[in-house]
Interface confidence: low
């Protein structure tokens, strides 16, 4: 029996203009951090991103991060070839720990992980991993985006050059080049077992300033399966002091994460202090608004064939410029509703813009997970006016993902619609 129905977007496709909406930050009135002279800052309120520049001048620079990356206008840089990773395939030692800093959850790496290539000036050592996430239900939480599309989580790995500095902090304080990788996490119907040690660790650092040692994990398994397709640009730290010293490597291909695993991020708390009252708040939407590119150029890797076999269905340009090989913007207003105990109705609206009319039909694609098996079905709706479809024989124990694509002449397609997750037989999500 379908007792409760919960339906939500699996991927928020908000453009940059939506970045200031739905921010659930608390009122922050702390003047300075107690233990140090670092200026206090927050992700919203009186000490939010628009005020960072008052205490950290670099936050007002012209080469700030994060940014939106428009793939179509990124130039291929022949110097950006395969990344060389060293130590990434080893299991982490039991000295690796995770901390809830109140602004993010950080993994402090205690093993030797090195990266070179990709135009980095030397062999860089990984220092730490940090995460940025949204509010709930797979909402946008990434700092960077590709073609305006943001992801539920962004993982950032920070590197420094150990030949030049004895520590990461020294490199920062001396305003010298560091490296950073950005990895997007995308909602998938199944748990990603590679993330289990991280998810388990999150449950041990729910409260601000909590620390825990992590079960062994393989850092390479937290990266996309294919590392060949990445973007490169010069930017900054995305938190104060916003130093413009970061060589960013942004991977195009996302890493899967299940909705259940995402919940561990949404369960993290932080503490805020107003005058003499301390309050406990959820740590959510811990991302900086995107910054203008100004006069910078984004490059993309020149690794042979790496861009051909990518997850382009996730990342095709949703902006649909005239040069896109798409016939329309995506179908919009996706909805999933139960018709009865075993059937669902998927509905949508016509794309806002059709570049190569007419739309001949719509393709509905849905996948589900049951007993660890992932299955997928696709069918076509011939009419371009009756914008709904019925899915029968729905299993109450399965998680479903739905998306719709418009099909035009010459088999040209639109971008895929927002993916909708549907979970039946759920009392609370």
């Amino acid at each position: 029996v379908l007792h409760y129905v919960v339906c939500f977007p699996a991927l928020t496709e908000g453009y940059v203009g939506a970045l200031h909406e739905n921010r659930h930050g608390s009122a922050v009135q702390i003047r300075r951090r107690k233990a140090s002279g670092d200026p206090y800052w927050a992700y919203s309120g009186a000490y939010g991103p628009e005020h960072w520049v008052t205490s950290s001048v670099s936050c007002g620079g012209r080469h700030q991060s994060p940014i939106d990356i428009l793939d179509q206008y990124a130039r291929v840089g022949e110097e950006y070839q395969e990344l060389q990773l060293d130590g990434f395939d080893n299991e982490s030692s039991n000295k690796t720990w995770m901390k809830n800093t109140g602004k993010t959850v950080a993994i402090l790496l205690k093993d030797d992980y090195f990266v070179s290539g990709a135009g980095l000036p030397g062999r860089f050592k990984a220092e730490k991993v940090e995460f940025h996430w949204g509010h709930s239900n797979g909402s946008a939480g990434s700092e960077h985006s590709i073609n305006g599309r943001r992801f539920p989580v962004e993982m950032q790995i920070f590197f420094y050059n150990p030949d030049d500095f004895d520590s990461f902090q020294t490199a920062i304080s001396e305003n010298r080049i560091i490296g950073a990788m950005a990895i997007f996490f995308q909602v998938s119907p199944r748990d990603n077992s590679a993330l289990d040690p991280i998810i388990h660790g999150l449950k041990g650092v729910v409260h601000h300033e909590k620390e825990t040692f992590l079960d062994p994990f393989v850092l390479r398994d937290l990266l996309p399966a294919s590392l060949g397709s990445y973007y490169r640009y010069t930017g900054s730290l995305t938190t104060p002091p916003c130093s413009e010293i970061v060589e960013w490597i942004v991977f195009r291909r996302p890493v899967p994460i299940s909705y259940h695993q995402l919940e561990a991020f949404y369960s993290i708390f932080t503490t805020e202090q107003q005058d003499h009252v301390k309050s406990v708040e959820y740590l959510r939407n811990n991302f900086r608004p995107q910054q203008r590119l100004h006069d910078r150029v984004v490059s993309k890797s020149a690794v042979r064939d790496s861009w051909n076999h990518d997850m382009t269905d996730f990342l095709e340009n949703p902006l649909g410029t005239e040069a896109s090989k798409v016939c329309s913007s995506p179908p919009i207003h996706m909805k999933v509703q139960p018709l009865n105990q075993t059937a669902l109705q998927v509905s949508w609206s016509q794309p806002e813009t059709i570049y190569h009319p007419p739309i001949m039909n719509y393709m509905i694609s849905y996948s589900w997970t049951k007993n660890e098996d992932e299955k997928e079905k696709t069918f076509t709706k011939d009419s371009d006016k009756d914008l709904k479809a019925t899915i029968s024989h729905v299993s109450p124990d399965s998680l479903y993902l739905f998306r719709v694509q418009a099909v035009c002449r010459n088999d040209m397609r639109s971008d895929f619609s927002q993916t909708m997750l549907f979970q039946a037989n759920t009392t609370r999500i």
Epitope: Y15, V16, G17, A18, L19, E50, V53, C59, G60, G61, R62, Q64, D68, L70, Q72, Y73, A74, G148, P289, Q290, Q291, R292, L293, H294, D295, R296, V297, V298, L319, G320, T321, E322, S329, T353, Y355
Partner: antibody, heavy 120, light 111 residues
Framework: AQSLEESGGRLVTPGTPLTLTCTAS????????MSWVRQAPGKGLEWIGL??????TYYASWAKGRFTISKTSSTTVDLKMTSLTTEDTATYFC???????????????WGPGTLVTISS | SFVLTQPASVQVNLGQTVSLTCTAD??????ASWYQQKPGQAPVLLIY???RRPSGVPDRFSGSSSGNTATLTISGAQAGDEADYYC?????????????FGGGTQLTVTG
């Protein structure tokens, strides 16, 4: 061919609100910065503000509060003007940035302009 | 506020080379664009990012930048080059942004 065209310019009395529309042909506005620029008779060009691909708006300091730029579809951008005075009499142009990948004030597509006259 | 300064008017003899300048504090850290505008017409982009010419612009028009001065050079001036020329740059930082126009230079071609 890619082009822009402004519409909505007319003679109005001071204080009357007015909305101008810029319509794009041959490309989608979702990737580009779209600026509004004006030119008073016999004077130079003056930037009013822009809306970027994501819908964020940026204004000249003198235009904040009185001028509002909005994207009404993938092919139209509006400029809403309030509290107009005779000083706002000008030809109003919309213009598109050359590339969306960076912004440097390089507008390669301009509309022919629409004349707004404020007079009592 | 950020101001771009251009000479109000410049004269050049037919067939000669003329340089139009544009100065501002910190222009060395900005890119300049140049536009040509003839009476009753919309401006036309001649140069962007200091030196780059869009397709369709004759190579008689070239741009350069040194220190806090951007320069538009027109070689072999023609009668049809008589127009107003504007330099443009951007100001702002982080997520703030402004486009700044110079006051314009009226070019007269004599002879």
């Amino acid at each position: 061919a890619q082009s822009l065209e402004e519409s909505g310019g007319r003679l109005v009395t001071p204080g009357t609100p007015l909305t101008l529309t810029c319509t794009a042909s041959g490309f989608s506005l979702y990737s580009y910065d779209m600026s509004w620029v004006r030119q008073a008779p016999g004077k130079g060009l003056e930037w009013i503000g822009l809306i970027d691909g994501g819908g964020n708006t940026y204004y000249a300091s003198w235009a904040k509060g009185r001028f509002t730029i909005s994207k009404t579809s993938s092919t139209t951008v509006d400029l809403k003007m309030t509290s107009l005075t005779t000083e706002d009499t000008a030809t109003y142009f919309c213009a598109r940035e050359l590339w969306p990948a960076y912004s440097s004030g390089a507008f390669n597509i301009w509309g022919p302009g629409t004349l707004v006259t404020i007079s009592s | 506020s950020f101001v771009l300064t251009q000479p109000a008017s410049v004269q050049v003899n037919l067939g000669q080379t003329v340089s139009l300048t544009c100065t501002a504090d910190t222009l060395s850290r900005r890119y300049a664009s140049w536009y040509q505008q003839k009476p009753g017409q919309a401006p036309v982009l001649l140069i962007y990012r200091d030196t780059r010419r869009p397709s369709g612009v004759p190579d008689r028009f070239s741009g350069s930048s040194s220190g806090n001065t951007a320069t538009l050079t027109i070689s072999g001036a023609q009668a049809g080059d008589e127009a107003d020329y504007y330099c443009v740059t951007t100001d702002g930082s982080g997520s703030s942004y402004l486009v700044v126009f110079g006051g314009g230079t009226q070019l007269t071609v004599t002879g």
